[in-house]
């Protein structure tokens, strides 16, 4: 549902940054008493290479409404879209474009979601239907990920700009995306 919504009409671009919908105060528990001291996942390095300066992976901000069937979020959410060729920066154009100015002969690096955050959203539905609450996954950061030919042909089917799930605006969750992002879809949608 959500992915189809993203693909079809949930990518409405809105000029201003919208507020994040907040859950009722009673659900905003003080979590300090029951958090794991070291339970957070370690941050991932943005690039899988020693020479970070050689690669370029851009994070574009998009503001959109989340949709689920006929229902739409009460407020827009802002998320990242990963863009860039992950090639040597000096060979990449300044402007983001579809053209491939640089093509690696060796391993293929792609700019894909690295970490995700969850955000609560309230979905308003037509016809007087009751509002819905959802947690949508949103991209929090991008990275250059080394992909093998096997990854490109096989495991990359499942994910597209779906790379959005839910979280609010505290610490973004480090979610290494494994070799699961369908780059063809990513390039088309992003």
């Amino acid at each position: 549902q959500g992915w189809q919504a993203f693909k079809n009409d949930a990518t409405e671009i809105i000029p201003e940054l919208g507020e994040y919908p907040e859950p009722p105060p009673e659900l905003e528990n003080n979590k300090t008493m029951n958090r794991a001291e070291n339970g957070g996942r370690p941050p991932h390095h943005p690039f899988e290479t020693k020479d970070v300066s050689e690669y370029s992976c851009r994070e574009l901000h998009f503001t959109r409404y989340v949709t689920d069937g006929q229902c739409r979020s009460a407020k827009p959410v802002t998320e990242l879209v990963c863009s860039g060729q992950c090639g040597p920066a000096r060979l990449l154009p300044n402007a983001i474009g579809r053209g491939k100015w640089w093509r690696p002969s060796g391993p293929d690096f792609r700019c894909i979601p690295d970490r995700y955050r969850a955000q609560r959203v309230q979905l308003l539905c037509p016809g007087g239907a009751a509002p819905r609450a959802r947690k949508v996954r949103l991209v929090a950061s991008c990275k250059c990920k080394r992909l093998t030919r096997f990854h490109n042909q096989s495991e990359l089917k499942d994910f597209g700009p779906e790379a959005a799930r839910p979280q609010k605006g505290r610490k973004p969750r480090p979610r290494a995306r494994g070799a699961k992002a369908n780059q063809a879809e990513l390039e088309n949608a992003y």
């Epitope: 009722p24 979590k31 794991a36 839910p166 609010k168 505290r170 610490k171 995306r177």
Partner: antibody, heavy 121, light 109 residues
């Protein structure tokens, strides 16, 4: 499709620790929000803790705070739940459970087969 | 910590309709508790039926539906089948901490 395979049954003495593993396939572990739930014989389900994608941290139920540790080995896509200072009342089946949707967070969609931990002197 | 309450047991006739409820000691259950419903049969792991109040999963039979009724989460079974005899648990999300209800033993008889 997410699949979770847990380690085998364990018998422990009071005061000891147990470490239950949960191997993920179909997704990488870092894509998922893993939770642990236990069920004592003839009793109901009890949430022990899990990864909260809003906080970006693992959160433990107050009852188990200080006695449980949930960790992940992302190189093998295996989650672990370690419970220390075991007592007889910790005898239970321990389940790992995770989400598995691409777009919405819907926790507890996929469950491991369960690991029976027996605490007996 | 919050306490989540369910009916300990309910009985329904084959083909009949029954509603299981799930209340919270902190007040009314709302959509922001993201109510979950699970079915568990003896010797098996739980199976998720409903997420986020009323979202069914691909494996959830159409006869199950979730809603909010009178400040509680509700699971309605319309047209009960013998195979629906099981234990049913609700689960509420309290801002990242979860609490299960005590379970409802549903008998189809």
């Amino acid at each position: 499709e997410v699949q979770l395979v847990q380690s085998g049954a364990e018998v422990k003495k009071p005061g000891a620790s147990v470490k239950v593993s949960c191997k993920v396939s179909g997704y990488t572990l870092t894509e998922l929000s893993m939770h642990w739930v236990r069920q004592a014989p003839g009793k109901g389900l009890e949430w022990m803790g899990g990864f909260d994608p809003e906080a970006g941290e693992t959160i433990y139920a107050q009852k188990f705070q200080g006695r449980v540790t949930m960790t992940e080995d992302t190189s093998t896509d295996t989650a672990y739940m370690e419970l220390s200072s075991l007592r007889s009342e910790d005898t239970a089946v321990y389940y790992c459970a995770t989400d598995g949707e691409l777009y919405w967070y819907k926790f507890f969609q996929h469950w491991g087969q369960g690991t029976l931990v027996t605490v007996s002197s | 910590q919050a306490v989540v309450t369910q009916e300990p047991s309910l009985t329904v006739s084959p083909g009949g309709t029954v509603t299981l409820t799930c209340g919270s000691s902190t007040g009314a259950v709302t959509i922001w508790h993201y109510p979950y419903w699970f079915q568990q049969k003896p010797g098996q792991a739980p199976r998720t039926l409903i997420s986020d109040t009323n979202d069914k999963h691909s494996w959830t039979p159409a006869r199950f539906s979730g809603s909010l009724l009178g400040g509680k989460a509700a699971l309605t079974l319309s047209g009960a089948q013998p195979e629906d005899e099981a234990e049913y648990y609700c689960l509420l999300d309290y801002g990242g901490s979860f609490v299960f209800g005590g379970g409802t033993k549903l008998t189809v008889l």
